[in-house]
Amino acid sequence: MMTGTIETTGNISAEKGGSIILQCHLSSTTAQVTQVNWEQQDQLLAICNADLGWHISPSFKDRVAPGPGLGLTLQSLTVNDTGEYFCIYHTYPDGTYTGRIFLEVLESSVAEHGARFQIP
């Protein structure tokens, strides 16, 4: 039975040209995290594998930085980066947990963080 929950940074906003940290945290389970995938819609951004470390997709390697932790840092943001991001936790023995973050990239300097929320 899957008992865990994913806590994410929720709905966030950031300035064009700036950077943002995407963070998820898996709690309420003793399952072992074996791999975390970061995806934007259906596009793979990065993988963090417990054994192998980070794989950053080649098309994002110049502006995606691993970490902190299992999170992901997006740099040199453009308006096109606005959208949904997913952290997909592969765990043993539970299976897969998915968290969702919505990022809005703003032209102005009025970027502010939304509240944290949980996805069961």
């Epitope: 074996t34 791999q35 793979l44 993988i47 594998n49 417990a50 054994d51 192998l52 470390g53 980070w54 794989h55 997709s57 080649p58 098309s59 390697k61 110049d62 592969h90 043993y92 023995p93 299976g95 897969t96």
Partner: antibody, heavy 119, light 107 residues
Amino acid sequence: EVQLVQSGAEVKKPGASVKVSCKASGYTFTNYYMHWVRQAPGQGLEWMGRIDPTSGATKYNDNFKGRVTLTVDKSTSTAYMELSSLRSEDTAVYYCAREGGFGYYFDYWGQGTTVTVSS
Amino acid sequence: DIQMTQSPSSLSASVGDRVTITCRTSENIFTYLAWYQQKPGKAPKLLIYNAKTFAEGVPSRFSGSGSGTDFTLTISSLQPEDFATYYCQHHYGIPLPFGQGTKLEIK
């Protein structure tokens, strides 16, 4: 066109070291991780290790117990694999292989370098 | 380490036949499985990754399926150039092991 061109065949004595090179072209060298895989005569494939050409960070197969060292030269887009304390069981074809765009599999391979260990 | 069991180890078939090769893993690897083709004296060539995604330029007669612990590579209609050795590999953690290989021979 992506190409991985490896150095030529080597014959080594037991206890010696060998260093095999793999020159990459046709893509941005630092955007893709590089792996090394070996194949003993008539046998299957064995993963040896992985290097991130950007940072030089490495991961190794424990089976090689510190005998393998992976390095890169970014200026020439070349990856290197050095294997030390050679024994006859290390006689094999050694391949460099580029990590795919979507995970830890291998989308392009070098032609292979035959290393023969014999006294 | 996750164990890989590939079967059969060898297989005789004729041009036009439908062929299936299976790969089993000792633990759940989700869909993180790749298939390679190797011809004598040549480097392996990627066919499939993520269990079912085609590598560039791979003919549509090849297909991959499965998830969890059971995976298959199917060749729908064998062509003369398909006689080779096929390997599965899980790409989910060290030591990125390969199956023992399946040698596909002409009957």
